[in-house]
């Protein structure tokens, strides 16, 4: 028989999305046991039929990768999990409506920080996503978000920071003291979607000035 409350077997069914990798996760409820099995289905918003996700039927783990199945940026999706306990009790719970553009979070960028004598160069590498273009290439975050820009900060001392920002990939902080340590932080910002990545941080030291030796 079905439990009085589905949350006895199943809780917190939701998408967790980062850089467009879309993972469905859930928790077992208080009456869930290690031998409870879970089956996952998904559908596009507006469609009637649910589709069973291959590789996520009668599984015991509490996550399922739906990146490929939810990879169309212009579509909205639902997923649902059905839990069946060893005793034959079952419960089904559905996610809220999911939009990868809206809900994905941004990981810190991949950055190379290069020390020079009186400057520090920062080169941001475009972030790939699992989404494929028509020509088979993987899209980068820059291909998806027109308004994406990088915010760079260099902590010079406790009271002074230098800032740079833009849509370029190469930046340089000039006018620095040789042989001095600095802390750089670089974030990805997408204002139209109110997105901001966690910062990439690099601790770098300018090179000593050998011209006087």
């Amino acid at each position: 028989h079905a439990p009085e409350d589905p949350s006895d077997l199943l809780q917190h069914v939701k998408f967790q999305s980062s850089n467009f990798e879309n993972i469905l996760t859930w928790d077992s409820g208080p009456e869930g046991t290690p031998d409870t099995v879970y089956s996952i289905e998904y559908k596009t918003y507006g469609e009637r039929d649910w589709v069973a996700k291959k590789g996520c039927q009668r599984i015991t783990r509490k996550s399922c990768n739906l990146t490929v199945e939810t990879g169309n940026l212009t579509e909205l999706y639902y997923a649902r999990v059905t839990a069946v306990s060893a005793g034959g009790r079952s419960a089904t719970k559905m996610t809220d409506r999911f939009s990868s553009l809206q809900h994905t979070t941004l990981k810190p960028p991949d950055v190379t920080c290069i020390s020079k004598v009186r400057s520090i160069q920062m080169i941001v590498h475009p972030t790939p996503t699992p989404i494929r273009a028509g020509d088979g290439h993987r899209l980068t975050l820059e291909d998806i978000f027109h308004d994406l820009f990088y915010h760079l900060e260099l902590q010079v001392n406790r009271t002074y920071q230098m800032h740079l920002g833009g849509k370029q990939r190469e930046y340089e902080f000039f006018g620095l003291t040789p042989d001095t340590e600095f802390l750089g932080t670089i974030m990805i910002c997408v204002p139209t979607w109110a997105k901001e990545s966690a910062p990439y941080m690099c601790r770098v030291k300018t090179l000593p000035d050998r011209t006087w030796t």
Partner: antibody, heavy 117, light 107 residues
């Protein structure tokens, strides 16, 4: 050398259609943001539309939504703007432009579109 | 949409004058502002990006600065070839929007 060459402008009646083209060379067209920008006679500049040539993602200014369609032919390195239901206020010089290394620094010479009866 | 209010709409300058043009954004746009120069019958030409960074090949008499949501383009000593219309552009969010333009004429 980056080159953008627009064509397809002309005189059209209100309610009519026109298709602008922009032939691009000198950069990797198939992974870029491409723009249409217009300038009405004696007026300022206005961004009309943008497309990412790899993802196909597009954006439009509100005044042209539902009437204009931006597209590309990546095999021919060409950007298009299909303009339907044209109004007199669409009269302008239309420029194509591209973003290279983060900067909108390359523009075509422009093509004149006149909407008049 | 983000509004860019540019002033003055026109100004008269003598050769060698210091000229200042300002743009006020209707909301925060970080440093995502560019300045363009346009001469009659030509496409715009990028002068400054990132509010204060000089584009390659642009004379050093052009400079840009930012204070909050207010941005300034300065020409430290106007030359004859600088007589043109100048536009600011916010590159923060779509739709990208220009200021109304400032026409710099000879006094």
């Amino acid at each position: 050398e980056v080159q953008l060459v627009e064509s397809g402008g002309g005189l059209v009646q209100p309610g009519g259609s026109l298709r602008l083209s922009c032939a691009a060379s000198g950069f990797t067209f198939s992974s870029s943001w491409m723009y249409w920008v217009r300038q009405a006679p004696g007026k300022g500049l206005e961004f009309v539309s943008v497309i990412n040539t790899r993802s196909g993602i597009t954006h439009y200014v509100e005044s042209v939504k539902g009437r204009f369609t931006i597209s590309t032919d990546n095999a021919k390195n060409t950007l298009f703007l299909q303009m339907n239901s044209l109004k007199s206020e669409d009269t302008a010089v239309y420029y194509c432009a591209t973003r290279i290394q983060g900067l909108i620094d390359y523009w075509g010479q422009g093509t004149q579109v006149t909407v008049s009866s | 949409d983000i509004q860019m209010t540019q002033s003055p709409s026109s100004l008269s300058a003598s050769l060698g004058d210091r000229v200042t043009i300002t743009c006020q954004a209707s909301q925060s746009i970080s440093s995502m502002l560019a300045w363009y120069q346009q001469k009659p019958g030509q496409a715009p030409n990028l002068l400054i990006y990132g509010a204060s960074r000089l584009q390659t090949g642009v004379p050093s008499r052009f400079s840009g600065s930012r204070s909050g949501t207010s941005f300034t383009l300065t020409i430290s000593g106007v030359e004859a070839e600088d007589l043109a219309t100048y536009y600011c552009l916010q590159d923060y969010s779509w739709p990208l929007t220009f200021g109304q333009g400032t026409k710099v004429e000879l006094k």
